[in-house]
Interface confidence: low
């Protein structure tokens, strides 16, 4: 057959779906690879073809669209499973073609088992809620397109394994789950089970997400440099190791990039000739406030190095701060015999 633009295996879209539940999978060609949509392609006389390779096999096979109860079907650019089976796991390819044009992409589909408490190897999306911030909601994700707006599904919410009923500060409201005042104790996995009828059958959609309660923007402050500070003087003799920690606290800020860096005499360490190393460590509080420590180290400090200016800088979306370390050369202790001799007028 003629050449086909092959976009390969799109591992960025590792699709995971639950066993024995409906799944609708859009052909990624129109979402990520081509500059036109399915309707345009269809109008231009292009045909969308689906096939697959089973797990641990190399052989490409056509998808069987003649299964009982139309278990697998195609509708426009969507491949439907009603429902999935465990052995549907594999690499799926959608190919758009006519006599003169061909483009295709493959993507992995993994059918995942869940247990009676919704535990599974499924990668869970994380939803961050601000601590003590007023009413916040999470919405049951990825359920659009499974049933028409005329169908009214039933939605049940769970925290971990337990149905959410009479919880103090968590209220199910259909597709939404409202947190009146989010607290650390609300951290955990939340599952919505959407049940809807279709052609005399009942289907369930299970969606689990992780809620992480984080610091509120109301409490956010610019970076705070705990070290260096005015109380600590780094007093060294030439030849000793100089170690200066820069420890900075950052409030949690959604999508903020926290940065810490040193300057020596106004230059970045990389831009000067002295042998300096910098090691960084990061720790987080339960609400994802961050403490970054960068330790500046000069193995054998010279008297020149002890005259330089060492400044720690920090920046977040809330602002930028800097603090100089107090570095000085240790005054040598008096050499007793010489001073004593001088004291007695020895020459």
């Amino acid at each position: 057959s003629e050449r086909c633009d092959d976009w390969g295996l799109d591992t960025m879209r590792q699709i995971q779906v639950f066993e024995d539940e409906p799944a609708r999978i859009k052909c990624p060609l129109f979402e990520h690879f081509l500059k036109f949509n399915y309707s345009t392609a269809h109008s231009a006389g292009l045909t969308l073809i689906w096939y697959w390779t089973r797990q641990d096999r190399d052989l490409e096979e056509p998808i069987n669209f003649r299964l009982p109860e139309n278990r697998i079907s195609k509708e426009k650019d969507v491949l439907w499973f009603r429902p999935t089976l465990l052995n549907d796991t594999g690499n799926y390819t959608c190919m758009l073609r006519n006599t003169t044009y061909c483009s295709k992409v493959a993507f992995p589909l993994e059918v995942v088992q869940k247990d009676s408490c919704f535990n599974s190897p499924m990668k869970l999306p994380v939803h961050k809620l601000y601590i003590e911030y007023g009413i916040q909601r999470i919405t049951c994700p990825n359920v659009d397109g499974y049933f028409p707006s005329s169908v009214k599904p039933t939605i049940t919410w769970y925290m971990g394994c337990y149905k959410i009923q009479n919880f103090n500060n968590v209220i199910p409201e259909g597709m939404n789950l409202s947190f009146l005042i989010a607290l650390i104790s609300n951290n955990g996995n939340y599952t919505c089970v959407v049940t809807y009828p279709e052609n005399g059958r009942t289907f369930h959609l299970t969606r689990t997400l992780t809620v992480k309660v984080v610091g509120s923007p109301k409490n956010a402050v610019p970076p705070v440099i705990h070290s260096p500070n005015d109380h600590v003087v780094y007093e060294k003799e030439p030849g000793e190791e100089l170690l200066i920690p820069c420890t900075v606290y950052f409030s949690f800020l959604m999508d903020s990039r926290n940065e810490v860096w040193w300057t020596i005499d106004g230059k970045k360490p990389d831009d000067i000739t002295i042998d300096v190393t910098i090691n960084e460590s990061i720790s987080h509080s339960r609400t994802e406030d961050e403490t970054r420590t960068q330790i500046l180290s000069i193995k054998k400090v010279t008297s020149e190095d002890l005259k330089r200016s060492y400044v720690c800088h920090a920046r977040s979306a809330k602002g930028e701060v800097a603090k100089a370390a107090k570095v000085k050369q240790k005054v040598p202790a008096p050499r007793y015999t010489v001073e004593l001799a001088c004291g007695f007028g020895a020459t």
Epitope: Q113, D115, N119, P121, G160
Partner: antibody, heavy 122, light 113 residues
Amino acid sequence: EVQLEESGGDLVQPGGSLRLSCAASGISFSSSDFMCWVRQAPGKGLEWVSCIYAGSSVSIYYATWAKGRFTISRDNSKNTLYLQMNSLRAEDTAVYFCARSTGSVGRGFNLWGQGTLVTVSS
Amino acid sequence: DIVMTQSPSSLSASVGDRVTITCQASQSVYNSNHLSWYQQKPGQAPKLLIYSASTLASGVPSRFSGSGSGTDFTLTISSLQPEDFATYYCQGEFSCVSADCIAFGGGTKVVIK
């Protein structure tokens, strides 16, 4: 060799407490492991006590009778499962097994320890 | 409470016999097939034989088989061997949302006739 080894079983008076440990060797707890405690009273059958899903601290389950008295926990860095037993009664006398269910999805307990004996008696 | 009823509680059989043990749950196991079977010998830990109602665990001889769905399950030993004399337990997994997650049957002791 892959194995689970329980320890901490002892003779304890009614009302007392005991902490059982289960150390895994040859494997690390993975996020899809269901780690559980099962007990067996002398001459009796198996009885489920509690499970913890290693992937999520939310997922902790107890038999109805164990709620409030027993606490399951784990330390993944030490590859160890624990069972804290408080307010012990004579009927808690049993061999306590720890068991692992890989995948936690109806796969059964494919790995068991040899058990540790807890005797509750005055 | 969930009850798993195993029958018979004990049975006498000879080497070469076909042995059938049944297990009935007071409510459907999760996914209709979350049922396992174990063999236990005196002084030893249980050993997994069958999971998901009918799947043979690794290293288990093919003379063992399981069947059933929902609430009623069967373990069959097609031709009893000397090493098969032991106690057998069924174990169901249930929805933890509404009940205890896991329950064991009372056991069936298979003894030499």
